[in-house]
C-alpha cells in the first residue's frame, strides 16, 4: 500500500532532497532555504538561487524549509511555573523547563506545569525525582501513600484504599472501640 501523501509532500517528492517543486512551474526544482531563514521568493529558473531571507527577531525556522513566514518563538508560561532554559534564536525555538527540584507534569502533548518534587517525609525515596516524573515514595509503617505524600494511618477511613496498608492500625482502633462498649 502506498501511504497517502499531502499535496506539499507529493510536490516535494518529485524533486531531490533539499529541493522543492516550484509552485507555478512543476518542471523547476528550487533549493530549500536553510534553517534560520524563510522563503521570500521562489527561484526564477533551474539552477538559479531561491531568495531566502533571515528570520526577524522573535521568529525562527529550525530546519530547511520553503515557508513563507518564520515561526513565532514560544514563550515560557510563568503561570505554569516554567522558566527559560535557552532563548529563541533564528534557528531554534525557546526551550522552557522547570527549576531545580521540580518536575514537569504534561497536561497535554505541548503543555506542562512545574511542580515541586516530593520529599517523602515519613517515608523513603524509592525512585528519585526526574525531569518528567515526581519522586516515588515508599511510606514507613503507620503511614500510607496519598497523592504521593505519606499520610498517617490515623487519617485512614475504612472505605479508602489505605485500609489494606493500615490494617493493623485499623484493627487496633476497632479493638479499642469494641473494648470500650462492653
Amino acid at each position: 500500500l502506498v501511504p497517502h501523501l499531502g499535496d506539499r509532500e507529493k510536490r516535494d517528492s518529485v524533486c531531490p532532497q533539499g529541493k522543492y517543486i516550484h509552485p507555478q512551474n512543476n518542471s523547476i526544482c528550487c533549493t530549500k532555504c536553510h534553517k534560520g531563514t524563510y522563503l521570500y521568493n521562489d527561484c526564477p529558473g533551474p539552477g538559479q538561487d531561491t531568495d531566502c531571507r533571515e528570520c526577524e527577531s522573535g521568529s525562527f525556522t529550525a530546519s530547511e524549509n520553503h515557508l513563507r513566514h518564520c515561526l513565532s518563538c514560544s514563550k515560557c508560561r510563568k503561570e505554569m511555573g516554567q522558566v527559560e532554559i535557552s532563548s529563541c534564536t533564528v534557528d531554534r525555538d525557546t526551550v522552557c523547563g522547570c527549576r531545580k527540584n521540580q518536575y514537569r507534569h504534561y497536561w497535554s502533548e505541548n503543555l506542562f506545569q512545574c511542580f515541586n518534587c516530593s520529599l517523602c517525609l515519613n517515608g523513603t525515596v524509592h525512585l528519585s525525582c526526574q525531569e518528567k516524573q515526581n519522586t516515588v515514595c515508599t511510606c514507613h509503617a503507620g503511614f500510607f501513600l496519598r497523592e504521593n505524600e505519606c499520610v498517617s494511618c490515623s487519617n485512614c477511613k475504612k472505605s479508602l484504599e489505605c485500609t489494606k496498608l493500615c490494617l493493623p492500625q485499623i484493627e487496633n482502633v476497632k479493638g479499642t472501640e469494641d473494648s470500650g462498649t462492653t
Epitope: 508560561r77 510563568k78 503561570e79 505554569m80 507534569h105 497536561w107 506545569q113 511542580f115 515526581n134 497523592e147
Partner: nanobody, 119 residues
Framework: EVQLLESGGGLVQPGGSLRLSCAAS????????MVWVRQAPGKGLEWVSH????????YYADSVKGRFIISRDNSKNTLYLQMYSLRAEDTAVYYC????????????WGQGTLVTVSS
C-alpha cells in the same frame, strides 16, 4: 468553602456558539489562575484552556484554538468560555477549576455543564 458553579451549556447545532460561565466563591478569585477542562462521553479529561490571574496570558488546546475565547471578570468572580464554530467533537461536560499548585490534581470542581453539538 470553595464553590465553582458552571452554567451556559446546552444543545447547539454544528457551527453554532455558546458562552459558558463559572461563578466562583469561597476563595480570592483574583489570585488564582483558572482552567477549563472537558470530558467527552467515555473519554478522559482534556485541558481546554487556561488564563492567568489578571486575564493577560491565555492558553488554548490545538483542538479549540481560533474558536474558543477564555476570559474572566475579577470584579464579578466569574470565568467565561466563549465557544464559536462548534463541532460534534466539542460535545462534553465542561468543568472550571483552579490551576493546581501543589501537584497534578484538581482540588475543587464544579458539577460541570453539558455541551451537546448535534444537528
Amino acid at each position: 468553602e470553595v464553590q465553582l458553579l458552571e452554567s451556559g451549556g446546552g444543545l447547539v447545532q454544528p457551527g453554532g456558539s455558546l458562552r459558558l460561565s463559572c461563578a466562583a466563591s469561597g476563595f480570592t478569585f483574583a489570585h488564582e489562575p483558572m482552567v477549563w477542562v472537558r470530558q467527552a462521553p467515555g473519554k478522559g479529561l482534556e485541558w481546554v484552556s487556561h488564563i492567568d490571574r489578571v486575564g493577560q496570558d491565555t492558553y488554548y488546546a490545538d483542538s479549540v484554538k481560533g474558536r474558543f475565547i477564555i476570559s474572566r471578570d475579577n470584579s464579578k468572580n466569574t470565568l467565561y468560555l466563549q465557544m464559536y464554530s462548534l463541532r460534534a467533537e466539542d460535545t462534553a461536560v465542561y468543568y472550571c477549576a483552579m490551576l493546581p499548585k501543589r501537584g497534578p490534581r484538581f482540588g475543587y470542581w464544579g458539577q460541570g455543564t453539558l455541551v451537546t453539538v448535534s444537528s
